[in-house]
């Protein structure tokens, strides 16, 4: 479907064409349930709440409504060269028995997440492959998406910025231009313990050292790769427990938010690191607000009830520009008996080094 937001003069400032699939985990009296449904063809733009952004005060937003009070919102932001969907939020009404049969709660829920939907100014964002955005108990997948904000003439621009998934991955990446002052390689990060608890007790136990590997363009147009350690002494942890999604959210030094999302394969009873999202500030970058996300990972896997352990350094590639180096990881998600790690499943790297 095509969605459009117009300004007072009738000129479109946001145009978006995509199909969307929702996967929502919710509780019923007989236990957790997962519902999947598509954005219906009669979904409409909420004109009163969508906006081209008021001068100097707010950014453009597209609010799409469907069903009995459900809304999907895309909030945009921009700088001199790029724009992005800074935040996607989904409000869903569990009293809609058509979409959420037998829901034990009838409340209205709100979930939101940063996204990696971004494009050059004056070009449209194009993504034929599915773009997944994970938000607590909800996953939204956009298919065949063409999105553009900050328009002035009610039509998509000729040029486009393709999403990461659509781009062919080169067999050998071109070398990055030399950086005038390469960052010194930091020492291994400190290992810290993290736990997330919900109404049913602990759903995540983790011990690990975290290092961010970031590649970005600086203001002088040189490309630099930096390694940043997450300092446990300057990091606060929070999270949430769900039947199908466990999240660990780390806020570090006031400028970095790192989100880990663990999923579960019900048929094989295995948990795994499914998604990583990063939101940080790089003062020397051409675009200081660095954001990256990937919700299709399959890392740190173990059987539910057991723990995953790896003494070797693990590299989890999130995007072309961002990976996480995880040191001495020991993690267990969903089922944590007595707040203690269960039987250990060693990583292949450790087994091979024995």
């Amino acid at each position: 479907a095509m969605f459009m937001v117009k300004n007072g003069q009738g000129t479109a400032c946001i145009m978006a064409q995509f199909s969307a699939a929702f996967s929502v985990n919710y509780d019923t009296k007989s236990g957790p349930k997962q519902m999947t449904f598509d954005l219906p063809s009669d979904a409409t733009v909420v004109l009163q709440r969508s906006s081209c952004g008021k001068e100097q005060t707010s950014d453009p937003s597209l609010v799409i409504a469907f069903g009995r009070g459900h809304t999907l919102t895309l909030n945009f932001t921009r700088n001199a060269t790029r724009y992005s969907v800074q935040l996607m939020s989904f409000v869903y009404n569990l009293s809609d028995t058509h979409l959420f049969p037998n829901a034990s709660s009838k409340e209205i829920k709100t979930v939101e997440s940063i996204t990696d939907i971004r494009a050059d100014i004056d070009k449209k964002y194009r993504c034929v492959s599915g773009t997944q955005v994970h938000m607590n108990n909800v996953t939204v997948t956009l298919h065949d998406a063409t999105i553009q904000a900050y328009l002035s003439n009610s039509s998509f621009s000729r040029g486009e910025t393709r999403c990461e998934q659509d781009r062919p991955s080169p067999t050998t990446a071109p070398p990055a231009p030399p950086s005038p002052s390469p960052s010194p390689v930091p020492k291994s990060p400190s290992v810290d313990k993290y736990n997330v608890s919900g109404t049913n007790g602990t759903c995540l136990l983790a011990s690990m050292g975290l290092q961010l590997n970031l590649t970005y363009e600086r203001k002088d147009n040189t490309t630099v790769t930096r390694l940043l350690n997450i300092n446990p002494n300057k990091t606060s942890a929070s999270g949430s427990c769900g039947a199908h999604l466990v999240t660990l959210e780390l806020h570090s030094e006031g400028t970095t938010v790192l989100l880990f999302q663990f999923g579960m394969n019900a048929s094989s009873s295995r948990f795994f690191l499914q998604g990583i999202q990063l939101n940080t500030i790089l003062p020397d970058a051409r675009d200081p607000a660095f954001k990256a996300a990937n919700g299709s990972l399959r890392a740190l896997q173990a059987t539910v009830g057991n723990s995953y352990k790896c003494n070797a350094e693990e590299h989890v590639r999130v995007t072309k520009a961002f990976s996480v180096n995880i040191f001495k990881v020991w993690v267990q998600a969903f089922k944590v008996e007595g707040g203690q790690f269960g039987s250990v499943e060693e990583c292949l790297l450790d087994e091979n080094s024995m």
């Epitope: 001068e55 100097q56 921009r78 700088n79 001199a80 060269t81 050059d120 100014i121 004056d122 070009k123 900050y150 328009l151 002035s152 003439n153 621009s157 000729r158 040029g159 147009n221 675009d287 200081p288």
Partner: antibody
Framework: QVQLQQSGAELVKPGASVKMSCKAS????????IHWVKKSPGQGLEWIGA????????PYSQKFKDKATLTADKSSSTTYMQLSRLTSEDSAVYYC???????????WGQGTLVSVSA | DIQMTQSPPSLSASLGGKVTITCKAS??????MAWYQDKPGKGPRLLIH???TLQPGIPSRFSGSGSGRDYSFSISNLEPEDIATYYC????????FGGGTKLEIK
């Protein structure tokens, strides 16, 4: 209609700095980048940098990153460019320019002549 | 930064004749190419954007073409007022001007 009004000519000494202005009118100031372009007999037209007044983000050409500083004042719809450590090479006409979305540089100020001389 | 190599630096042609200027980008610029006319004492004037789209009010004697890294600009049926310096500009990735071509009439 879109108008870009630049400040007057400047005669400055080598080593000094100069700050010129570009006042925009006829459109929503925070919706468009303002670019600065140098025109000199020896080098022709050169793109210096741009600023997005909405948040002050300013990418620069590699050549001018240590020479020029771009700022914007939303309350007066004015963009400024400061040039530092001036030499005779910096003697030129400097234009502020607004792009018309994806139609390149469509609107030009009248230019500010900077003469660097002892 | 993307580099733009414009040639020739200068050229001389007869009234009524035709001239062609070329610009080569250091990488593919996806047809985000514009051409400007610059006369002494005046500000540069946008003639063509998006490689081949004429700005309103620009005579059809001016034309542009190209793709990828290679672009060209032509003026046919030269007139005296065409004496100027012409510049290409890429705006696919940041912004870069070519070195300019000074056009003189024989």
């Amino acid at each position: 209609q879109v108008q870009l009004q630049q400040s007057g000519a400047e005669l400055v000494k080598p080593g000094a700095s100069v700050k010129m202005s570009c006042k925009a009118s006829g459109y929503i100031f925070t919706n468009y980048n303002i670019h600065w372009v140098k025109k000199s007999p020896g080098q022709g037209l050169e793109w210096i940098g741009a600023i997005y007044p909405g948040n002050g983000d300013a990418p620069y050409s590699q050549k001018f990153k240590d020479k020029a500083t771009l700022t914007a004042d939303k309350s007066s719809s004015t963009t400024y460019m400061q040039l530092s450590r001036l030499t005779s090479e910096d003697s030129a006409v400097y234009y502020c320019v607004r792009a018309n979305w994806d139609v390149a540089f469509a609107y030009w100020g009248q230019g500010t002549l900077v003469s660097v001389s002892a | 930064d993307i580099q733009m190599t414009q040639s020739p630096p200068s050229l001389s042609a007869s009234l009524g004749g035709k001239v062609t200027i070329t610009c080569k980008a250091s990488q593919d610029i996806d047809r985000y190419m514009a051409w400007y006319q610059d006369k002494p004492g005046k500000g540069p004037r946008l003639l063509i954007h998006d490689t081949s789209t004429l700005q309103p009010g620009i005579p059809s004697r001016f034309s542009g073409s190209g793709s990828g890294r290679d672009y060209s600009f032509s003026i046919s049926n030269l007139e005296p007022e065409d004496i100027a310096t012409y510049y290409c500009l890429q705006y696919d990735n940041l912004w870069t001007f070519g070195g300019g071509t000074k056009l003189e009439i024989k």
